[in-house]
């Protein structure tokens, strides 16, 4: 092995380099010293480093490492942050459109029910938004509340408009009768099923994206241990003490050091891979009744159908409710009277199937494809960081932590390090508490994602089919089946494309299908066009 080059007799180069790190030269010896007080850059001869310099190098090494880690994750972080924000905004827009569609349906078909219907619809969709954003609200309660509120208004305004004002105290009786008599048939249950399934999936999708951000933020801001700081210092700076300013660390040596420093972080890898694959599975199942865009934008039609169902049964209902609520002031508001079965419309309820082009669905899949390119992010981190910091190619004429070598030998390097610092010990310490916490959160979300992954076969649940509804598929080439009944309905070939291209922002006055065009809200439209088109500033 070649002898080390002669050290700088005046430590001049070391002084000028160190001054860039730490203004002032009081810590730098003018000429090489024995360095017996050094703890990291243990000298084999005279050295241009002091204990204070060594401490500064350690601090700088740890900061460098943190910056390298942050730049390594910047593209991934940007991808998830932007998509989480874009999807959340897009879901809010879908909810707003769904509300406007429903209000427009009431205005066009049942003007006598407004403005009360608008109030109930508004409250329902507020609950939907709160649920998506993580509120602990029960979907069945939300749907029940919508129908509980609507029925007294439907009864007093549509079915029995001649009721005197004094009879309005029957509202409470009607509210109870709504459930007891199943006045809307199975429509409330159908809506509960569709809304709960689609919103659950939407909510967990957003939760998963937000956890992804939290994972990156956690590993992004890791504070590296003093042991790691010593290893990094030895790799990046100890050569300077010998006046070897231009020498680069050996690549193999860098990998060993990085694997030691990042042993805890790399433990995330298994759960990160599972996270991306589970998220992909979830996204693959987000269609039909598991797609909130599809379900919510079709709700106006199902609610319309449910009101038509009430109207079809108006004769029997009016008679029954006349008996039930005649003495509403005297009776306790709980019905014990169950009439003979009302007319049940065994209508084929077809659940809409949205073409995937230009919809939120295609954007979700695009995001997954981009995320999958980061599936090995954590296992590849040590290598990535070494490839983005100065290392000698081919491990020739490089620094191995103690001296300049012609060729790097991992065994020799490890033997040389034993008396200074035990790499194996660092690995055995296990992950930082914050890393352990984030691993626990990943385990939890992965379990949720697995639980939520959809059965692919049938559109409607079996129990719904058994209760008087038949599930029917819309052919892929057909127009949507979602708004097939009633005046003023629309057939939606492709919902978000419809929203984007026609630039509708429906107000109450703009019924679905009405000819007048509202002023487009540019920010909403651009949201759909730009959804998921994430271009990292690094690319």
């Amino acid at each position: 092995q070649p002898p080390p080059p002669p050290p700088d007799a005046t430590c001049h180069q070391v002084r000028s380099f160190f001054q860039r790190l730490q203004p002032g030269l009081k810590w730098v010896p003018e000429t090489p010293v024995p360095g017996s007080d050094l703890q990291v850059c243990l000298p084999k001869g005279p050295t241009c480093c002091s204990r204070k310099m060594e401490e500064k190098y350690q601090l700088t090494a740890r900061l460098n490492m943190e910056q390298l880690l942050q730049s390594a994750s910047m593209e991934l972080k940007f991808l998830i942050i932007q998509n989480a924000a874009v999807f959340q905004e897009a879901f809010e827009i879908v909810v707003r459109h769904a509300k406007n569609y429903t209000n427009a349906m009431f205005k066009n078909n049942y003007p006598s029910l407004t403005p009360q219907a608008f109030e109930f619809v508004g409250e329902f969709f507020t609950d939907v938004s709160l649920y998506i954003l993580g509120s602990d609200i029960n979907v069945d309660d939300m749907v029940n509340e919508l129908f509980d509120s609507l029925f007294p208004v439907i009864y007093t305004q549509l079915m029995n408009p001649g009721l005197p004002d004094s009879a309005l105290d029957i509202n409470e009786c009607l509210r109870g009768a709504r459930r007891d008599l199943k006045v809307f048939g199975n429509f409330p249950k159908l809506i509960m099923t569709q809304v709960s399934k689609s919103l659950q999936v939407t909510r967990i999708f957003l939760q998963a994206l937000n956890l992804g951000i939290e994972v990156i933020n956690t590993t992004d801001h890791l504070k590296f241990s003093k042991d790691c700081g010593r290893m990094l210092t030895r790799m990046w700076y100890c050569s300077y003490c010998q006046g070897l300013m231009m020498v680069k660390p050996c690549g193999g040596y860098c990998n060993v050091v990085m694997q030691g420093c990042m042993a805890g972080v790399v433990e995330i890898d298994k759960y990160w891979r599972e996270y991306i694959l589970s998220l992909e599975e979830l996204v693959n199942g987000m269609y039909r009744i598991y797609d909130m865009e599809n379900v919510l934008l079709g709700l106006f039609s199902t609610i319309h159908d449910s009101i038509q169902y009430v109207q079809k049964n108006a004769g029997k209902l009016t008679t029954t409710i006349g008996k039930l609520c005649a003495h509403s002031q005297q009776r306790q508001y709980r019905s014990a009277y169950y009439p003979e079965d009302l007319f049940i419309d065994k209508k084929v309820l077809k659940v809409a199937h949205v073409e995937h082009e230009e919809t939120l669905s295609s954007r979700r899949r695009e995001l997954i494809q981009k995320l999958k390119s980061f599936i090995s992010f954590y296992s590849a981190l040590p290598g990535y960081i070494c490839s983005h910091s100065p290392v000698a190619e081919n491990d020739t004429l490089c620094w191995n932590g103690q001296e300049l070598v012609e060729r790097y030998s991992q065994k020799a390097a490890r033997n040389g390090m034993k008396n200074q610092f035990n790499l194996h010990e660092l690995k055995m310490k296990g992950p930082e508490p914050v890393v352990s916490q984030i691993i626990d959160k990943l385990k939890h979300i992965n379990q949720l994602l697995r639980t939520m992954s959809m059965p692919k076969g049938r559109v409607l649940d079996k129990n719904l089919d058994e209760e008087g509804f038949e599930s029917g598929d819309c052919g892929d080439d057909e127009d949507e089946c979602i708004g097939g009944s009633g005046d003023g309905m629309i057939k939606v070939k492709n919902q978000l494309r419809f929203l984007a291209e026609l630039a509708y922002d429906l107000d109450v006055d703009d019924a679905p299908g009405n000819s007048q065009q509202a002023t487009p809200k540019d920010n909403e439209i651009s949201t759909f066009h730009n959804l998921g088109n994430v271009h990292s500033p690094l690319k």
């Epitope: 409250e123 507020t126 938004s129 709160l130 029960n138 069945d140 509340e145 109870g176 508001y333």
Partner: antibody
Amino acid sequence: QVQLQESGGGLVQPGRSLRLSCAASGFTFSTYAMTWVRQAPGKGLEWVSSISSSGESTYYADSVKGRFTISRDNSKNTLYLQMNSLRAEDTAVYYCAKDRRGSHADAFDVWGQGTLVTVSS
Amino acid sequence: QSALTQPPSASGSPGQSVTISCTGTSSDVGGYNYVSWYQQYPGKAPKLLIYGNSNRPSGVPDRFSGSKSGTSASLAITGLQAEDGADYYCQSYDSSLRVVFGGGTKVTVL
């Protein structure tokens, strides 16, 4: 007419338990969310706990979480508040309130007259 | 959860107007959430005046009106009457659906 009547209040020692009840009449109890609100002497209103119409969802103020439990029996039109590990700062008039809606606490359109709970040794 | 912020007192002569403010955060008043207002006389239970930011239950005079903008809400009483002297509380809920009240405003009719 619509009415809420609280009962079960009284004097209790710190660390002990008490169960408040609220009997509802004049409305379809099972379709509305219900809430307990308290008011310490000379102080403002403080929300304690809420429960959705089905009883599936319950919500608690941080100050009572883990000590108080809200529940309802829709067949009896009754709301309950089980108060354990009572403290001096729990002394207040406890109001039972009906929500306008069923899904969660939003606005309280009917209130009981309140029952006084005094926690003192 | 911290209380919404209300001024402790407000006053006006009969026939005048009084406005009470209620300030919250983006997670309660400023979110999707609705604001309600209550009137309370000493020793009595509160009474709902406004729900859903600006809606009046039947029986509440139209002298009372509510509004919401951003993270603030306000209750306006026009044509102040002697019986309007009472405590007024705003109320909303946060993103966890936990209810939050304001500290209360004592309105004095001079």
